[in-house]
Interface confidence: medium
């Protein structure tokens, strides 16, 4: 029977800069029941606080609701593991909410083959930002990526779309069924998961070249 091993805070994520969650990996339990607590203070303050919510994020997590989240302050946190034989502490982790945002995937992905009379046909892809993100405040700049491939192809083709929420692609293989997905990330932060795939059948008379 031993004191617990050193835990590690391995990930913190926020869906929208308004709330965030951190997760830790327990160290070895020393063969005894072990309690974990996360404590934190904000940069410039000395007062230590305990995690406000150990439930919402699942096991080995701490969730910071709206009233505990400030995007203008750096959080300094550590996890304490305790059993009957003693305690151990994780390394301190510095968390700036601005840099841990991982939004939900974009919504309402629509894909359409456009065949204007006077120009080459093209694939038109359109989507909406995730609902949790409020772009009107100016706190967020969301960047988007599109990926597509013929249904049976092994490799995706990825396009960076910048901040625009629509994209045109020419030169697709006629008669093939394509999968299209989109994802987003804030200017400082993490890519969302890819949106559910949308399928589009390219007509056999689609012009391949420019």
């Amino acid at each position: 029977q031993l004191p617990p091993g050193k835990p590690e805070i391995f990930k913190c994520r926020s869906p929208n800069k308004e709330t965030f969650t951190c997760w830790w990996r327990p160290g070895t339990d020393g063969g005894l029941p072990t309690n974990y607590s996360l404590t934190y203070h904000r940069e410039g303050e000395t007062l230590m606080h305990e995690c406000p919510d150990y439930i919402t994020g699942g096991p080995n997590s701490c969730h910071f609701g709206k009233q505990y989240t400030s995007m203008w302050r750096t959080y300094i946190m550590m996890v304490n593991a305790t059993n009957q034989m003693g305690s151990s502490f994780s390394d301190e982790l510095y968390v700036d909410v601005t840099y841990i945002v991982q939004p939900d995937p974009p919504l309402e992905l629509a894909v359409e083959v456009k065949q204007p009379e006077d120009r080459k046909p093209y694939l038109w892809i359109k989507w909406s930002p995730p609902t949790l993100i409020d772009l009107k405040t100016g706190w967020f700049t969301l960047l988007y990526e599109i990926r597509l491939k013929p249904e049976k192809a092994a490799e995706w083709e990825i396009h960076f779309a910048g901040q625009q929420t629509e994209f045109k692609i020419l030169s697709l293989h006629p008669g093939q069924k394509y999968l299209v997905q989109v994802r987003c990330k804030p200017d400082h932060g993490y890519w969302s998961a890819w949106s559910p795939a949308t399928f589009i059948q390219i007509p056999s008379d689609f012009t391949m070249n420019d």
Epitope: Y122, R147, E157, H159, G162, Q163, F167, I169
Partner: antibody
Framework: EVQLLESGGGLVQPGGSLRLSCAAS????????MHWVRQAPGKGLEWVSD????????NYADSVKGRFTISRDNSKNTLYLQMNSLRAEDTAVYYC???????????WGQGTLVTVTS | QSVLTQPPSASGTPGQRVTISCTGS?????????VHWYQQLPGTAPKLLIY???QRPSGVPDRFSGSKSGTSASLAISGLRSEDEADYYC???????????FGGGTKLTVL
């Protein structure tokens, strides 16, 4: 026929400013992304900036961020690059290019030379 | 640092096939971003030669072809001609730079 004609290059001292223009013709200018790309004498190509069709979106290379501003006037079919706080390493031929799908640069102008020297 | 690496020079005799490589990293080509190739004849502006890895714009001869695999892309020129003597550049978007990245360029000499 697609044509892009750059102008506004010249000799300028370090710390000075210059505004490049690119006059477009032969296509519906307001429907396309546009880019600026530069090439230092005897060197390779370096992307500088791009702008979306309605000016909603702009991107910049780190080397020019905060100093250069890309803009366009769709009523005049003209693309601009305002260059401030110029440095010797900004000396290059500046090309404007049209961006097609995947923002590939499918047509290029002949370029205008910017020389920054004291 | 994000870079697209090309050999500085390549050469071949008329009629030969030459290949120019472009090696990137997991933040550009390996990431899945498409590769474009540009040709710059002496004293002129660059011209789009291959786009989206392997597509040829209209007017580009089928002697030019492109391919991409993993973190690299290649431009192949078959039936080499004297007028192919030029600088060739690859380009791809780079995720970590949030910008377009050009290769250093390859000077092709037709012997």
């Amino acid at each position: 026929e697609v044509q892009l004609l750059e102008s506004g290059g010249g000799l300028v001292q370090p710390g000075g400013s210059l505004r490049l223009s690119c006059a477009a013709s032969g296509f519906t200018f307001s429907s396309y992304w546009m880019h600026w790309v530069r090439q230092a004498p005897g060197k390779g190509l370096e992307w500088v900036s791009d702008i979306s069709s309605a000016s909603s979106y702009t991107n910049y290379a780190d080397s020019v961020k905060g100093r250069f501003t890309i803009s366009r006037d769709n009523s005049k079919n003209t693309l601009y690059l305002q260059m401030n706080s110029l440095r010797a390493e900004d000396t290059a031929v500046y090309y404007c290019a049209r961006g097609l799908d995947a923002r590939r640069m499918d047509y290029w102008g002949q370029g205008t030379l910017v020389t920054v020297t004291s | 640092q994000s870079v697209l690496t090309q050999p500085p020079s390549a050469s071949g005799t008329p009629g030969q096939r030459v290949t120019i490589s472009c090696t990137g990293s997991s933040s550009n080509i390996g990431y899945g971003y498409v590769v474009h190739w540009y040709q710059q004849l002496p004293g002129t502006a660059p011209k789009l030669l291959i786009y989206r890895n392997n597509q040829r714009p209209s007017g580009v001869p089928d002697r030019f072809s492109g391919s991409k695999s993993g973190t690299s892309a290649s431009l192949a020129i078959s039936g080499l001609r004297s007028e192919d003597e030029a600088d060739y550049y690859c380009a791809a978007w780079d995720d970590s730079l949030n910008g377009w990245l050009f290769g250093g360029g390859t000077k092709l000499t037709v012997l």
